[in-house]
């Protein structure tokens, strides 16, 4: 049913869903802090623009007795229950921040007439792509897929002269929410990644993964997995690895690789890590002091969600436009706004764009070094280290299929 919005006459409210099931196990108190810090910034920005209005957030908590698993995979109904609660209380704001679970977001989108914008820190799955009033502030699976396909095809860098067309994907079902949907997208037979690859097999058992590492009859030298170095070590340990194996470790929301004193363990030498370019000012900010490097991005997405709302509110108010209209609901896309840690760009479908960073372990220094970066907004690669000190032969990434010989003429334009 149509819920009246607390969103006019100089008073603008943000409804923040505080759900038991969340993409990251972040204490709700930290998310509240992030939202409150965002509100302070928004108020300041509106005041500086000469807009004398009130902006507040209402935190909507779900029933902990019903939804207390903390696991996104049981979150399907939680969002709808919260919306019902909002409806009963007639407490809908101008914008909804949350949920972060893909199942929950998908279900809410399916079962409600969303005449207001929804901002999510998460909702990584392909099923949340191309939703007209949904904005996602953490890199969704589609962005990862586009990078991987682009990188697979690349054969004109001095360190990557073979196009790849094969891959193993390790997915055992115990992944974190982000990894679950990233790998799910790679596994899906109808996805862009699957469409562009000639061979792809999902490894579901630890033993399958371990056997591939030295299997002379393997069908690909490339294995994609998702998680941190410790996750890889638990799986791989100190097992021998064939010299032309390349493990791509997707670990987007982890800043630890960029910390000064970090040394790459020996088991990472055959690994390329895909992560996001770290923020500069987050390390000392008041809201992030209690956060681990992996949690910063989640809390930051909540904070940036508030700043995004403030940005759009400012534009609409300055233009004398109504906030409770479909136009406002559909406006949270194809724009750049000033986020907490610099400009944040949203694509045509409201998904955040970012700079992905591919790291390798230098055999000389045992440090993580940047190999290349990739701008998801323009789908463009920026090489960084043209002569990397790789573990692989001739300082080049190997062919994806052993013994296939040169692939020089697999040109892609």
């Amino acid at each position: 049913s149509q819920v009246s919005q607390n969103c006019h006459n100089g008073s603008y409210e943000i409804s923040v869903l505080m759900m038991g099931n969340s993409a990251f196990a972040e204490p709700l108190k930290n998310l509240e802090d992030a939202v409150n810090e965002g509100l302070e910034i928004v108020r300041g920005r509106l005041q500086n623009a000469g807009l004398n209005v009130t902006v507040n957030a209402t935190f909507m908590y779900s029933d902990g007795l019903i939804h207390n698993s903390g696991d996104c995979r049981s979150s399907t109904c939680e969002g709808l229950d919260l919306l019902r609660k909002i409806s009963n209380a007639q407490r809908m704001g101008c914008v909804l921040i949350g949920p972060s679970c893909t199942y929950s977001t998908f279900q809410m989108y399916l079962d409600t007439e969303l005449s207001y914008p929804m901002i999510s820190a998460g909702s990584f799955g392909l099923s949340c792509d191309y939703k007209e009033t949904l904005t996602r502030l953490m890199s969704p699976a589609r962005k990862l897929m586009y990078f991987l396909v682009n990188f697979w095809k690349t054969n004109d860098l001095p360190f990557k002269t073979y196009s790849w067309s094969t891959s193993y994907v390790y997915k055992n079902g115990t992944e974190t929410e982000d990894c679950f949907w990233y790998l799910n997208a790679l596994e899906a037979s109808v996805s862009y990644f699957s469409h562009e690859l000639g061979f792809k097999v999902v490894l579901r058992q630890d033993k399958e993964f371990q056997d591939i590492l030295m299997d002379h009859n393997r069908k690909s030298n490339v294995i994609i997995m998702c998680g941190g170095p410790e996750f890889l070590y638990k799986l791989k340990g100190d097992r021998a690895v064939a010299e032309d194996i390349v493990i791509i470790l997707v670990d987007l929301f982890n800043d630890q690789y960029f910390e000064d004193n970090v040394t790459a363990p020996d088991y990472m030498k055959n690994v390329l890590v895909l992560t996001l370019s770290p923020g500069n000012s987050l390390l000392n900010s008041s809201f992030s002091r209690n956060l681990s490097p992996t949690k910063r991005d989640f809390a930051l997405a909540y904070l940036n969600g508030i700043l995004l709302f403030g940005h759009m509110l400012k534009i609409f108010l300055e233009n004398g436009e109504n906030i409770t209209t479909p136009k406002f609901a559909h406006a949270f896309r194809n724009l750049t706004f000033e986020g907490y840690d610099g400009p944040v760009t949203l694509d045509d479908w409201g998904d955040v764009d970012s700079t992905m960073v591919l790291l390798y372990t230098s055999v000389d220094t045992k440090k993580y070094k940047v190999l290349l970066t990739y701008d998801t907004h323009v789908n463009k690669t920026y090489p960084v280290d043209m002569s990397p000190t790789f573990t692989w032969k001739n300082s080049k990434l190997p062919n994806d299929i052993t013994g296939r010989g040169p692939q020089h003429h697999h040109h892609h334009h």
Epitope: N155, D156, P158, P383, S387, H408, H411
Partner: antibody
Framework: EVQLVQSGAEVKKPGASVKVSCKAS????????MNWVKQAPGQRLEWMGV????????NYNQKFKDKATITRDTSASTAYMELSSLRSEDTAVYYC???????????WGQGTTVTVSS | DIQLTQSPSFLSASPGDRVTITCSAS?????MYWYQQKPGSSPKSWIY???NDASGVPSRFSGSGSGTEYTLTISSLQPEDFATYYC?????????FGGGTKVEIK
């Protein structure tokens, strides 16, 4: 409009050092690698090294690693190459050239002539 | 290092002629890059990734080839095309250039 403007010609004595600058404009300096290329009279072009201004990563051609030192000042959008222990065979025109992968060396500076003579 | 050998080193031709310059690599490369340089000027990017014209390059220029043999072709030579052309590879590190082909007016 992308422009790479290099410092003026230099005449140096053997054993001295020289620092050539390359000021970039018309694009985001930290987004693109910067190369240095040598063109000695009557010789082919020789690639000397490349720097990524954002991360400070530098790769040298082994032939020039004891001769050239590449640095940058990101606040001034300027790349530098210092040549040490100059000898007569270092007499050449030195160019900076930007990468815009996949089009390597897509824009070049106007060149800086370094003459080494006693 | 990969050696690039250009032939011919000098080429005399008349406006309207079809001109072909070849670049031979000492080992196989995926792509070739070409640059044009006029006297007293810096080189200009001319063709990248074997067959892609850089911006502003006339359509009479084309590149082709694979493996160790690559060519730059000018379908109908114009007065402004008289210059030196260099090939370059970045398949192996370090990148290397050919010795150049000087296209002169006959």
């Amino acid at each position: 409009e992308v422009q790479l403007v290099q410092s003026g010609a230099e005449v140096k004595k053997p054993g001295a050092s020289v620092k050539v600058s390359c000021k970039a404009s018309g694009y985001t300096f930290t987004d693109h690698n910067m190369n240095w290329v040598k063109q000695a009279p009557g010789q082919r072009l020789e690639w000397m090294g490349v720097m990524n201004p954002k991360f400070g990563t530098i790769n040298y051609n082994q032939k020039f690693k004891d001769k050239a030192t590449i640095t940058r000042d990101t606040s001034a959008s300027t790349a530098y190459m210092e040549l040490s222990s100059l000898r007569s065979e270092d007499t050449a025109v030195y160019y900076c050239a930007r990468d815009d992968y996949p089009n390597y060396f897509d824009y070049w500076g106007q060149g800086t002539t370094v003459t080494v003579s006693s | 290092d990969i050696q690039l050998t250009q032939s011919p080193s000098f080429l005399s031709a008349s406006p309207g002629d079809r001109v072909t310059i070849t670049c031979s690599a000492s080992s196989s490369v995926n792509y070739m890059y070409w640059y044009q340089q006029k006297p007293g000027s810096s080189p200009k990017s001319w063709i990248y990734r074997t067959s892609n014209d850089a911006s502003g390059v006339p359509s009479r220029f084309s590149g082709s080839g694979s493996g160790t043999e690559y060519t730059l072709t000018i379908s109908s030579l114009q007065p402004e095309d008289f210059a030196t052309y260099y090939c370059q590879q970045y398949h192996d590190y370090p990148p290397t250039f050919g010795g150049g082909t000087k296209v002169e007016i006959k």
